[in-house]
């Protein structure tokens, strides 16, 4: 069941899913200058059986200028509007990611992917919070939020995290935060993330396929 609202906003914090629950959808759009082929799926879908989960559908984009040219690109949508962005670097060892049953990993970046990824989360999804660079985490409990459904309405639980002005950035779960997930990612940022159910991550291929440069959307 799709979450029809957004994870909570925590001042001076950002969130990330470290794995995507089956049913999660990822918008399949193309970067500027490319468009999705007419027969192409508008989404990738995390699907699976009891033993394995993976992203269904391939995104195919064709150059807007050259009609006959098609390229496969990662299913990342173009920004709907111009927004300020800031970059953060994160080492991500895909092979070392823990495989959670019923979950898909972050799809790897492909050539010519668009500027942002928009995910549509489902009930049961957990996202993890960390303070942005220059802020330190004060915890009252887990720095995570879970999408739950009550009386047919979806809601996200409130993460027990306060970010206070310090010099040291806090880490994603597993990077010095004992109460949360063991397979999180270290990140640093300089502004408050607009947290949305369709979480947007801008990615580019860096030195290797295991190194992502994430640019996240801010306001």
């Amino acid at each position: 069941e799709l979450c029809d609202d957004d994870p909570p906003k925590i001042t001076h914090a950002t969130f990330k899913a470290v794995a995507y629950k089956e049913g999660t959808m990822l918008n399949c759009e193309c970067k500027r200058g490319f468009r999705r082929i007419k027969s192409g799926s508008p989404y990738m879908l995390c699907t699976g059986n009891s033993s394995h989960s993976s992203w269904d559908n391939q995104c195919q984009c064709t150059s807007s200028a050259a009609r006959n040219t098609t390229k496969q690109v990662t299913p990342q949508p173009e920004e709907q509007k111009e927004r300020k962005t800031t970059e953060m670097q994160s080492q991500m060892q895909l092979a070392d990611q823990v495989s959670l049953p019923g979950h898909c990993r972050e799809p790897p970046p492909w050539e010519n992917e668009a500027t942002e990824r928009i995910y549509h989360f489902v009930v049961g999804q957990t996202v993890y919070y960390q303070c942005v660079q220059g802020y330190r985490a004060l915890h009252r409990g887990p720095a995570e939020s879970v999408c739950k459904m009550t009386h047919g309405k979806t809601r996200w639980t409130q993460p027990q995290l306060i970010c206070t002005g310090e010099t040291e950035p806090s880490q994603f779960p597993g990077e010095e935060e004992p109460q949360a997930s063991p397979d999180g990612l270290p990140e640093s940022e300089t502004s408050r993330l607009v947290t949305t159910t369709d979480f947007r991550i801008q990615t580019e291929v860096a030195a290797t396929m295991e190194t992502f440069i994430f640019t996240t959307e801010y306001q």
């Epitope: 029809d4 609202d5 309405k153």
Partner: antibody, heavy 116, light 106 residues
């Protein structure tokens, strides 16, 4: 109490555009997505898309991506759906419905008739 | 897209009858939701998350099912129940509805 009040019926010429409004009251407008659903005469319900009023983010049913444009005005707690290049097959009742999960509140519907 | 197929399309029944409407989804879904619509009116939420009754809905309505097969049952049809019923899935985009089942007077 929660209310969604839509604009009145419209009669339009083929090729023209129409903008249907949906004014929300009784709840925090920016806390819920606003969805739009179409019902052609004697037909079933079709989901068209939604908007997040707080950010203007929209998601569309691909079938209506080139037909409908959904917007919202936070200052007046109003969502809009504009239909372009109208054709006779766009004749339908258009409903707004509050999201956040199941559609628990609906507007009364706006009949758009496209006729030459 | 997930296709929702309701059966029957039209159901003729009398007050007091037990009425069953089925909805089949083309792919597995988490939950089914049901709406009731009367002529000239907006749809009204009837049952959510497969089996939960919406506020103010009489206990004669019930829902069941899982996976791809779901059922709406009216245990004893009342005059106010003559209407069109729609199943609805919101497990994946685009959100889809069944084509509707019209319950009419026999």
């Amino acid at each position: 109490q929660v209310q969604l009040v839509q604009s009145g019926a419209e009669v339009k010429k083929p090729g023209s555009s129409v903008k249907v409004s949906c004014k929300a009251s009784g709840y925090t407008f920016t806390s819920y997505r606003m969805h739009w659903v179409r019902q052609a005469p004697g037909q079933g319900l079709e989901w068209m898309g939604y908007i997040k009023p707080s950010r203007g983010y929209t998601e569309y049913n691909q079938k209506f991506k080139d037909k409908a444009t959904i917007t919202a005005d936070e200052s007046t707690n109003t969502a809009y759906m504009e239909l372009s290049s109208l054709r006779s097959e766009d004749t339908a009742v258009y409903y707004c419905a509050r999201g956040g999960g199941v559609f628990d509140y609906w507007g009364q519907g706006t009949l758009v008739t496209v006729s030459s | 897209d997930i296709q929702m197929t309701q059966s029957p399309s039209t159901l003729s029944a009398s007050v007091g009858d037990r009425v069953t409407i089925t909805c089949s989804a083309s792919s597995k879904i988490s939950y089914m939701h049901w709406y009731q619509q009367k002529p000239g009116k907006a749809p009204k939420l009837l049952i959510y998350t497969t089996s939960d009754l919406a506020s103010g809905v009489p206990a004669r309505f019930s829902g069941s099912g899982s996976g791809t097969e779901f059922t709406l049952t009216i245990s004893s049809l009342q005059p106010d129940d003559f209407a069109t019923y729609y199943c609805h899935q919101r497990s994946t985009y685009p959100l889809t509805f069944g084509q509707g089942t019209k319950v009419e007077v026999k």
